[in-house]
Interface confidence: low
């Protein structure tokens, strides 16, 4: 088989026939050096998954539940292409599983016990697997058989396809539990009708069900959605209030050597030639000899799944949790104190050492998880491998786009009521050597630049956002002659000034000596022309405050700030000479951990925060010899956010807009992956 062949896996005679037709028609429109199709027939989807894992086939299209199976070891497959529905302008690749209730019913998600439930059908995703998976650990013991536990949890149900003899309560609202449209409460519309008629208190359906069944907004306003955080929202706010976000139909391939680019090339060309309304003789999204053969008949096209996206991220935390609960049937035994330990994400070796020390001192309240980059940490928090970390505003933006929420903000000024008063932010500045007297904001082209890291606020988003507005392109590596911006591509001129050795060169962590605020300032001291940092960086590293050999003899007076109006000012005049106000760093977590992270961190800062006077003999949470490990070293306390509890509210409209503009220049694979799930 030539290298450019994609071996498609078919699961029935009819699929194999369509696959052969697909193969032959692609041959007729694609040049001989382009991708081609070969067909492999297997008895079931699980056999196809195994065949792909064993390199006997390359691709198959799966429903969400099977994507989960495909991801599990030893298969280790990943999503590579998604089918989309709706229009090309507004492609829908996911649907949302929701819990719909009547507006006046007054109960929340954690009060479903004893209510009457309406399901689309036993074993179906939105109607059964997701809600029952999420409620699994609330079901009464014994949880097996599952139908019995569910019957004992709700006071009555309609779960079409259930066994009405063994589990009559599941058929209480729809006698007989008929498994077809002859049962008026079967399927999405049926489950909604069960709620509408007053038979049930809650219906587990898709987000679109209510719109398909009630054309009139006034009618829709009689219903609400139950959210996982025990609140309710209007039915059109399903993106912020759902049980899970579920991919509709996805092509999977091997994680390593999986031909994902070739599969995309093939399917992209296939949709050009044989997609919706393209060809009479062969149609990709049509199944004359059956239904949904190879691809869903209702699909409109394909979208490439971002390469950073593994199956866990693609399926989402809630969906994976629900399915895992159902499959594994195990519930965590909660510890006897109030919250489970918070798993803190530590970047690289230095942060891990400090985190381990914190963990020991916290007596089990804090556990540590390691990752090499901030984005890897965010991904681990998303999928539940970690729970929390403190982030620069630029990464708060990415974390927010990935569904995480800010819980506490670092405060940098001493005040009587530190914990209750989140600050307005710090200043992003451009620092130069006083001796380079001709350098201004307007003549930085061709100079050597020093950045905290790509994607961070003071070191990248603010200065590069301002620069982008001036030069209208993203080729910052051409604008500066060279620089150090950790996180840039290794062959970029913006890695040339970096000092890390070997593989650590230009890495966005402390193994790169020019990483972070102190690192960017050191880069200026030793090699650069301008450093983009925060207003406290220069005073914190001059006048003997930083004892490291490179910094111990530095004098604040030898540095100046560049102002946006083309003038320069002394370092202490940052309030009148800065690039922008930056939001303080903030701790982020998943929504379901918000309360516990908030509680445990507030306890921890009372024990190890700024009130500790001697850090030589005691553990100090906000100290690390100017290395800003886990938290910025100038943190005085972690402050409550009050109502600024979403990433947009926390960062503020202006900053979100600035970062949004810069997204055209984004090199963030994680941001690309998260915006695929939520554009």
């Amino acid at each position: 088989v030539p290298d450019k062949t994609v071996r498609w896996c078919a699961v029935s005679e009819h699929e194999a026939t369509k696959c052969q037709s697909f193969r032959d028609h692609m041959k007729s429109v694609i040049p001989s050096d382009g991708p081609s199709v070969a067909c492999v027939k297997k008895a079931s989807y699980l056999d196809c998954i195994r065949a792909i894992a064993a390199n006997e086939a390359d691709a198959v299209t799966l429903d969400a539940g099977l994507v989960y199976d495909a991801y599990l070891a030893p298969n280790n497959l990943k999503p590579v292409v998604a089918e989309f529905y709706g229009s090309k302008e507004d492609p829908q690749t996911f649907y949302y599983a929701v819990a719909v209730v009547k507006k006046d019913s007054g109960f929340q998600m954690n009060q479903l016990r004893g209510k009457k439930s309406c399901h689309t059908g036993l074993g179906r995703s939105a109607g059964w697997n997701i809600p029952i998976g999420l409620l699994y650990c609330d079901l009464p013991e014994p949880r097996k058989p599952l139908e019995k536990a569910v019957a004992n949890f709700f006071s009555g149900s309609c779960a079409p396809c259930a066994d009405g003899t063994d589990f009559p309560q599941l058929c209480q609202l729809c006698p007989g539990c008929g498994c077809s449209t002859l049962n008026q409460y079967f399927g999405y519309s049926g489950a909604f009708k069960c709620l509408k008629d007053g038979a049930g208190d809650v219906a587990f359906v898709k987000h679109s069900t209510i719109f398909e069944n009630l054309a009139n907004k006034a009618d829709r306003d009689q219903y609400e959605l139950l959210c996982l955080d025990n609140t309710r929202k209007p039915v059109d706010e399903y993106k912020d209030c759902h049980l899970a976000q579920v991919p509709s139909h996805t092509v999977v391939a091997r994680s390593m050597g999986g031909k994902e680019d070739l599969i995309w090339e093939l399917l992209n060309q296939a949709q050009e030639h044989f997609g919706k309304d393209k060809s009479k003789e062969f149609q990709l999204f049509s199944s004359p000899h059956g239904k949904d053969l190879l691809f869903k008949d209702s699909a409109h096209g394909f979208l490439k799944v971002p390469p950073r996206m593994d199956a866990k991220m693609y399926l989402g935390y809630e969906y994976v949790t629900a399915i895992r609960n159902l499959r594994e049937g195990t519930c965590p035994e909660a510890p006897t104190d109030e919250c489970k330990p918070v798993k803190w994400c530590a970047l690289s070796h230095h942060e891990r050492l400090k985190c381990d020390e914190w963990s020991v001192n916290s007596v089990g309240k804090i556990e540590c998880v390691s990752a090499e980059t901030t984005e890897d940490c965010i991904a681990k928090i998303m999928n539940g491998e970690a729970d929390a970390m403190s982030l620069d505003g630029g990464f708060v933006y990415i974390a927010g786009k990935c569904g995480l929420v800010p819980v506490l903000a670092e405060n940098y000024n001493k005040s009587d009521n530190c914990e209750d008063t989140p600050e307005a932010g710090y200043f992003a500045i451009a620092v130069v050597k006083k001796s380079a007297s001709d350098l201004t904001w307007d003549n930085l082209k061709g100079k050597k630049s020093c950045h905290t890291a790509v994607g961070r606020t003071a070191g990248w988003n603010i200065p590069m956002g301002l620069l982008y507005n001036k030069i209208n392109h993203c080729r910052f590596d051409e604008f500066f002659s060279e620089g150090c911006a950790p996180g840039s591509k290794k062959d970029s001129s913006l890695c040339k000034l970096c000092m890390g050795s070997g593989l650590n060169l230009c890495e966005p962590n402390n193994k790169e000596g020019y990483y972070g605020y102190t690192g960017a300032f050191r880069c200026l001291v030793e090699k650069g022309d301008v450093a983009f940092v925060k207003h406290q960086t220069v005073p914190q590293n001059t006048g003997g405050k930083n004892p490291d050999p490179w910094a111990k003899n530095l004098n604040e007076k030898d540095y100046e700030l560049l102002c946006l109006d083309g003038t320069r000012k002394p370092v202490e005049e940052y309030a009148n000479c800065h690039l922008a106000r930056a939001p303080n760093h903030a701790v982020v977590t998943r929504k379901d951990k918000e309360a516990c992270v908030h509680k445990i961190l507030r306890q921890q800062q009372h024990l190890f925060g700024s009130n500790v006077t001697d850090c030589s003999g005691n553990f100090c949470l906000f100290r690390s010899e100017t290395k800003d490990l886990l938290f910025r070293d100038d943190t005085v306390c972690l402050a409550k956010l009050h109502d600024r509890n979403t990433y947009e509210k926390y960062l503020g409209e202006e900053y979100v807009k600035a970062v949004g503009n810069l997204r055209k220049c984004s090199t963030s694979s994680l941001l690309e992956a998260c915006t695929f799930r939520r554009p």
Epitope: R113, D138, A334, P335, A595
Partner: nanobody
Framework: QVKLEESGGGLVQAGGSLRLSCVAS????????VGWYRQAPGKQRELVAA????????NYADSVKGRFTISRDIAKNTVYLQMDSLKPEDTAVYYC??????????????WGQGTQVTVSS
């Protein structure tokens, strides 16, 4: 919801004993840990003793180990705290608590109203 009602508190001499009871009603299937906290005037609420409903794990504060015993009667949905060799520093309001099973949904612990225990010297 789960409702918790404590009883058995009172005034006792140092060295004496008391037995606190806590009856749970409502959605008791959804509970996976029960126990007792106490709060002395001007102090933080602190864990005294707790046990998982399966009985697989029991926890005591260091200050009460060997003196207090937590037990439960599943049939009666009741958890007990047997307090022996009481000391004046055990004086506090004792709260019964129940922890819901923690799935992915956010849960709050359930608390009783509290019962006063006073140990005089």
């Amino acid at each position: 919801q789960v409702k918790l009602e404590e009883s058995g508190g009172g005034l006792v001499q140092a060295g004496g004993s008391l037995r606190l009871s806590c009856v749970a009603s409502g959605n008791v299937f959804g509970i996976d840990a029960v126990g007792w906290y106490r709060q002395a005037p001007g102090k933080q609420r602190e864990l005294v003793a707790a046990t998982t409903t399966s009985g697989s794990s029991t926890n005591y504060a260091d200050s009460v180990k060997g003196r207090f015993t937590i037990s439960r009667d599943i049939a009666k949905n009741t958890v007990y705290l047997q307090m022996d060799s009481l000391k004046p520093e055990d004086t506090a309001v004792y709260y019964c608590y129940a922890r819901p099973k923690q799935a992915t949904l956010i849960r709050d612990d359930y608390w009783g109203q509290g019962t006063q225990v006073t140990v005089s010297s």
